[in-house]
Structures are given as structure tokens and as C-alpha cells.
């Protein structure tokens, strides 16, 4: 089941997935001045069998002005400046994406890809939050959000993260004003199912890596 909404927005924070569950779709979007090749794939789809998952379909962009020139090679350095990186800028990658059954790793960029990636996440997907550069994290719990199915509707859990400017005088963590959950009630009251995850330890690590930045925006 696809998640009906985007993961929650946290001021001065970005999120990313470390691995993508089977069923996730990534729209084949091209940057301005380029378009998908004629009859080209509309999206990539994470799919596979119990032992191996990979992205089916390939995104290909071509210049809007010229015909029959297809591009799908890895971007050159000057082109990479144009798109926001999808990798964490840190050697401490929390999970080995390849080792997660039923998941795909971050799809490689395609030439002339749009700057923003439009992902369609599925129930059970987890994303990790991190404060942007210049802000530091105050958190009472995991800086993650999971898409859950509750009473037949999908919703994202609220990440327990507040990003505060480093120059600001901030409250002590114990005095933080609690962030409201999407329905305005505590998690325990709204959830019909409890999901535990193997990611818990890695999540804490990801949340505290303040030197690394996520810059991709997901829709």
C-alpha cells in the first residue's frame, strides 16, 4: 500500500531513506529544458524476489529542443552541482542497504535529472531526519518516521526531533515543548499496531551525525 502523504516536515531538518522498500516508486523527472524520452518510463519501481531487490525501469531524459538523443549516464561533476545530492555527506552510513532483504538502495542519478526527487513510499518505509547545517538536534527519541497503516488509513509517525540554531539560547532537552503527533494525540492512542524495527540503533547514530547533511527534498 502506498503512503497517502509525505513524511512530516520538521523545521530546519531534512529526511532521507537509507533503503527503499519494495513497491516504492520514483518518478522519472527531468530538469528544465529536458523531458523524458518518448514512450520512456514514467517511474522506477523497487521490485524483485525474496533474495534480491532492484529498481525496474530506467529513467531517461532528452533535450526538449533536440530529438532522439537519450541520456542516462552518470552525471559529470558540473552537472552534479545542479542536482541535490541524495547521499549523506558522512562516512557513517547507518545501514548497509544491500543487506536489507526486500529493499533497494538509493537509485543512482540519471543525466539531466530534476533537482527534486518524487518518491512514492509504501507502508513500513522508514525515513531518518537530520538538522540542516547551522542547526543542532534536540531530541527525546528517535529522529525517524515510519509510514504505518492505522484503521485502514496510512500515516507517518512523528519524529522526535527539534532543530535549534547553534547561536540561539535553547531550552534544555527536558524542557522542550512536545511536538504534536499528526492527529494531535499521543502516538499510543492513535496506533492500532506497534512496529518494532531493526533500525533503532542505527537511527540514533544517524540522528546525532550533525556534521552530515541531507539535501534532497522528497515529495
Amino acid at each position: 500500500e502506498l503512503c497517502d502523504d509525505d513524511p512530516p516536515e520538521i523545521p530546519h531538518a531534512t529526511f532521507k531513506a537509507m533503503a527503499y522498500k519494495e513497491g516504492t516508486m520514483l518518478n522519472c523527472e527531468c530538469k528544465r529544458g529536458f523531458r523524458r524520452i518518448k514512450s520512456g518510463s514514467l517511474y522506477m519501481l523497487c521490485t524483485g524476489n525474496s533474495s534480491h531487490s532492484s529498481w525496474d525501469n530506467q529513467c531517461q531524459c532528452t533535450s526538449s529542443a533536440t530529438r532522439n538523443t537519450t541520456k542516462q549516464v552518470t552525471p559529470q561533476p558540473e552537472e552534479q552541482k545542479e542536482r541535490k545530492t541524495t547521499e549523506m555527506q558522512s562516512p557513517m552510513q547507518p545501514v548497509d542497504q544491500a543487506s536489507l532483504p526486500g529493499h533497494c538502495r538509493e537509485p543512482p542519478p540519471w543525466e539531466n535529472e530534476a533537482t527534486e526527487r518524487i518518491y512514492h513510499f509504501v507502508v513500513g518505509q522508514m525515513v531518518y531526519y537530520q538538522c540542516v547545517q547551522g542547526y543542532r538536534a534536540l531530541h527525546r527519541g528517535p529522529a525517524e518516521s515510519v509510514c504505518k497503516m492505522t484503521h485502514g488509513k496510512t500515516r507517518w509517525t512523528q519524529p522526535q526531533l527539534i532543530c535549534t540554531g547553534e547561536m540561539e539560547t535553547s531550552q534544555f532537552p527536558g524542557e522542550e515543548k512536545p511536538q504534536a503527533s499528526p492527529e494531535g494525540r499521543p502516538e499510543s492512542e492513535t496506533s492500532c499496531l506497534v512496529t518494532t524495527t531493526d533500525f533503532q540503533i542505527q537511527t540514533e547514530m544517524a540522528a546525532t551525525m550533525e556534521t552530515s547533511i541531507f539535501t534532497t527534498e522528497y515529495q
Epitope: 502506498l2 497517502d4 502523504d5 513497491g23 517511474y43
Partner: antibody, heavy 117, light 104 residues
């Protein structure tokens, strides 16, 4: 539950245009690609094109490009397919269908378009 | 443009018979989808990712294949299986022209 309800049958003259609607309910309309597929009497299914209502991105089959326009009204959760310069060969049942990624999971009931002078 | 060619066009079969429908793509693909359509009905998702059954599809249906050649098999045909089956290439959105199964 997910439903796609299409507009009623149309009879058109050659050279005219037809606009078929597809009203979606029971899901987040902006987050799924919506496709249009047609089926002339006793013939194959033909993919015409698709729209992503979230940003109005469209893709068309080369066979219909220039004659077909697919649009979406997100406030009404409705997709539209307009086919112009109709000819007798365009007589067909036209379907809208939601793209689940793995497959087209929900289809409209179909709209019969008859082109006749 | 990728073309998917199905065979046979029509097959007349008896209940309990094993039925095989084939679909050949004009270029190698990763996966194939299959739809079932009954007269005066919209198509229904049937098999996806070559071999996975959509929800509600009886276990007598199976799919296989790779590269350019794909197969839909019905192990022991039942009367309710009378329909037209279409293969579908999701990367190019092209459909085969269908195989109509008629019950003898």
C-alpha cells in the same frame, strides 16, 4: 474504497473532439499516475497516455501525440482525456486506470465513444 | 516502440485442461504483467512481475518467463476462466493483443 467513475457514452461526428472524464475517490488522487487506455470493438488494448496529478506531468503514446490531451483537476479529483480530430477508427471504449506501480490496479467502467457521420 | 506479440489469438479448451498462453516482447524486458478481461467488463490485474499473483487470483494461475519470452499457465482450467488475457509491458505501457480462452 477506491473508485473510478467515468462519464457517459458519446456519439461524435468525424473531425470533432471528445472529452471523457474520470472521477476518482477513495484515495489520494495527486499521488498516483492515471492512465488512459482504449479498446476498439473486438480489438487490442491501446495505451494512450498518462498524467501525474501531483504536478500535471504527462506522457503520451507516440500514436496519439498531438491529438490527445490529458489533464487533471485536483480540486475535483478528476482526470480528463480529450481526443481531437476524431475519425471512425477512434470508435472505442475508453478506460481510465490508476497506476499502482506493479500494475494498473483500478479501472473505470469504460466510456463508449462512437464516431459516425 | 516495444511490441508484445501474444499467441494464440484464440484457444478453445475443455475444463480441467492445462492451458498455456505465450507473450513475446520485441526486446528483452525485466518483467511482464498479465490482465484478465471478461466481456463487457474492465480489465483486471492478474499476474505481475512475471510470476506474482494479484490478490484474489486462484492458485491454478501462474506466470513465468524472462528476457523476451513470457508464459501464463492455467493448471486446471475452470469455466470461470473463460476470458481474454492480455500481457502488458509496464516500462513501455504496451499491451499484447490478447488471447481469448473459450470453453468447449
Amino acid at each position: 474504497q477506491v473508485q473510478l467513475v467515468q462519464s457517459g457514452a458519446e456519439v461524435k461526428k468525424p473531425g470533432a473532439s471528445v472529452k471523457v472524464s474520470c472521477k476518482a475517490s477513495g484515495y489520494s488522487f495527486t499521488r498516483y499516475w492515471m492512465h488512459w487506455v482504449r479498446q476498439p470493438p473486438g480489438q487490442c488494448l491501446e495505451w494512450m497516455g498518462a498524467i501525474y496529478p501531483g504536478n500535471s506531468d504527462t506522457s503520451y503514446s507516440q500514436k496519439f501525440e498531438g491529438r490527445v490531451t490529458i489533464t487533471a483537476d485536483t480540486s475535483a479529483s478528476t482526470a480528463y482525456m480529450e481526443l481531437s480530430s476524431l475519425r471512425s477508427e477512434d470508435t472505442a471504449v475508453y478506460y481510465c486506470s490508476r497506476d499502482y506501480g506493479y500494475y494498473f490496479d483500478f479501472w473505470g467502467q469504460g466510456t463508449t465513444v462512437t464516431v459516425s457521420s | 516502440q516495444i511490441v508484445s506479440t501474444q499467441s494464440p489469438d484464440t484457444q478453445s479448451v475443455t475444463p480441467k485442461e492445462k492451458v498455456t498462453i505465450t507473450c513475446r516482447a520485441s526486446s528483452s524486458r525485466s518483467y511482464m504483467q498479465w490482465y484478465q478481461q471478461k466481456p463487457d467488463q474492465s480489465p483486471k490485474r492478474w499476474i505481475y512481475d512475471t510470476s506474482k499473483s494479484a490478490s484474489g487470483v486462484p492458485s491454478r494461475f501462474s506466470g513465468s518467463g524472462s528476457g523476451t519470452d513470457y508464459t501464463l499457465t492455467i493448471n486446471s482450467l475452470e469455466a470461470e476462466d473463460a476470458a481474454t488475457y492480455y500481457c502488458h509491458q509496464r516500462s513501455s505501457y504496451t499491451f499484447g493483443c490478447g488471447t481469448k480462452l473459450e470453453i468447449k
